[in-house]
Amino acid sequence: GITNINCSGHIWVEPATIFKMGMNISIYCQAAIKNCQPRKLHFYKNGIKERFQITRINKTTARLWYKNFLEPHASMYCTAECPKHFQETLICGKDISSGYPPDIPDEVTCVIYEYSGNMTCTWNAGKLTYIDTKYVVHVKSLETEEEQQYLTSSYINISTDSLQGGKKYLVWVQAANALGMEESKQLQIHLDDIVIPSAAVISRAETINATVPKTIIYWDSQTTIEKVSCEMRYKATTNQTWNVKEFDTNFTYVQQSEFYLEPNIKYVFQVRCQETGKRYWQPWSSLFFHKTPETVPQVTSKAFQHDTWNSGLTVASISTGHLTSDNRGDIG
């Protein structure tokens, strides 16, 4: 960066090189050039010469003042106009940054995705800081009182093998950057309560010719968890509102859910599951599209289709459950 150049003087920033966005700042440039009494001192920001708010302080020093500085990063350097020199002489340069202190991390969440071997902890970091912000995740066993710390820039994956202090833990997050430090509330977790089943996937759909044509959605999960609750939501792509079907599932076999849908309409389906009675859901599965036939013939749709999307109707299913209407987005 600009800070690696050979200097013939000194450049510095007040109040600091990293400062709060929107502050008034002063950048000082002091020349120390052999055989040069600078006639003028010039400032450059990102290669553009600054024209305004430059004040000469003394023979060797000038100040550039910025009001309400809002740029997250800028490269500054200054030059001198020396008598008998045709070109400006470089004095020094500095990278400056502006941003915000971190907000208090909130919505700390830790989950174990089945088969991952990791506990994944996430949080809401709050507003963008614009500057380098580090997070320390503290994990303290409630049984042994042993505490471990993990440094990260965003979320953290902690190997479940390293969680040797039993099943109950306190987790909290500390956020810190050059402008401040904040700490979240403590989250109490039990490892058995935070497991999210292996992802449920819709594999195919078929519409069967019958007196009243019906569509069967086939879906499955590799989970070994016995008691799993799932939701399937669907809608015609032209609609806004999802219809949601809830059911208890045993994944010892591929699930089949029946829907009585309108002909010649494109539908979109998604599924998600959780361990029954626990807190955390899987994210909704990938969008699965199926267009119902105009009338009689059997139509099969396969998984991993990608298409434009966007809504719903009435349903029946081999699984037990009930129908609800839903405007929810993806909720954890």
Partner: antibody, heavy 119, light 107 residues
Framework: QVQLVESGGGVVQPGRSLRLSCAAS????????MSWVRQAPGKGLDLVAD??????????YYADSVKDRFTISRDNSKNTLYLQMNSLRAEDTAVYYC??????????WGQGTLVTVSS | DIQMTQSPSSLSASVGDRVTITCRAS??????LAWYQQKPGKAPKLLIY???SLQDGVPSRFSGSGSGTDYTLTISSLQPEDFATYYC?????????FGQGTKVEIK
């Protein structure tokens, strides 16, 4: 050699607008700052507006007396400087000179164009 | 903005006289000073820049000196064509500012 030719001056009523032009030749227009300096009858020289060179990203300056009324601009493809003067007042009556600066002193000047604001 | 005060505001002199015009800045301008000559109905003409550097084509009877806040334009031997108004300009800090002018008249 450097040549600056102003045009667009004339007699105008208070509150009306006028646009001055300055056609430049004989130097690298992009690399120089361009200014409008005015001289009221029998008075001294005053910098009215300035548009800087490419190295300054064409930063503009206006004297407090003309801020929000005058607009300086340049067309680098035509080597021409402009001054759009709106809401003219009697005190804007002056000879308007186009001037060139590479450093910050004015190296070359046009012959001037007279603007008279009178009802 | 930096204020420039020129003195005298006018002077009468004869051909062959040595004439001195001074310009004082409201703060140190580090030799960033130019001098201009203006004749009636004409545009100003650059004589001196950087306090003491003579612009190409300007007769050597014109010279400039000074540092800090005080600067001088000297015409060593006044010629008939030198009767005009002279202005100083500081370009140390933006925006550049002019002195109010010194009129050199025939005695």
């Amino acid at each position: 050699q450097v040549q600056l030719v102003e045009s667009g001056g004339g007699v105008v009523q208070p509150g009306r607008s006028l646009r001055l032009s300055c056609a430049a030749s004989g130097f690298d227009f992009n690399s120089y700052g361009m200014s409008w300096v005015r001289q009221a009858p029998g008075k001294g020289l005053d910098l009215v507006a300035d548009i800087n060179s490419k190295s300054y990203n064409y930063a503009t300056y206006y004297a407090d007396s003309v801020k929000d009324r005058f607009t300086i601009s340049r067309d680098n493809s035509k080597n021409t400087l402009y001054l759009q003067m709106n809401s003219l007042r009697a005190e804007d009556t002056a000879v308007y000179y186009c001037a060139v600066h590479h450093s910050d002193y004015f190296e070359y000047w046009g012959q001037g164009t007279l603007v008279t604001v009178s009802s | 903005d930096i204020q420039m005060t020129q003195s005298p505001s006018s002077l009468s002199a004869s051909v062959g006289d040595r004439v001195t015009i001074t310009c004082r800045a409201s703060q140190d301008i580090y030799t960033n000073l130019a001098w201009y000559q203006q004749k009636p109905g004409k545009a100003p003409k650059l004589l001196i820049y950087h306090a003491s550097s003579l612009q190409d084509g300007v007769p050597s009877r014109f010279s400039g000196s000074g540092s800090g806040t005080d600067y001088t334009l000297t015409i060593s031997s006044l010629q008939p064509e030198d009767f005009a108004t002279y202005y100083c300009l500081q370009d140390s800090e933006y925006p550049p500012t002019f002195g109010q002018g010194t009129k050199v008249e025939i005695k």
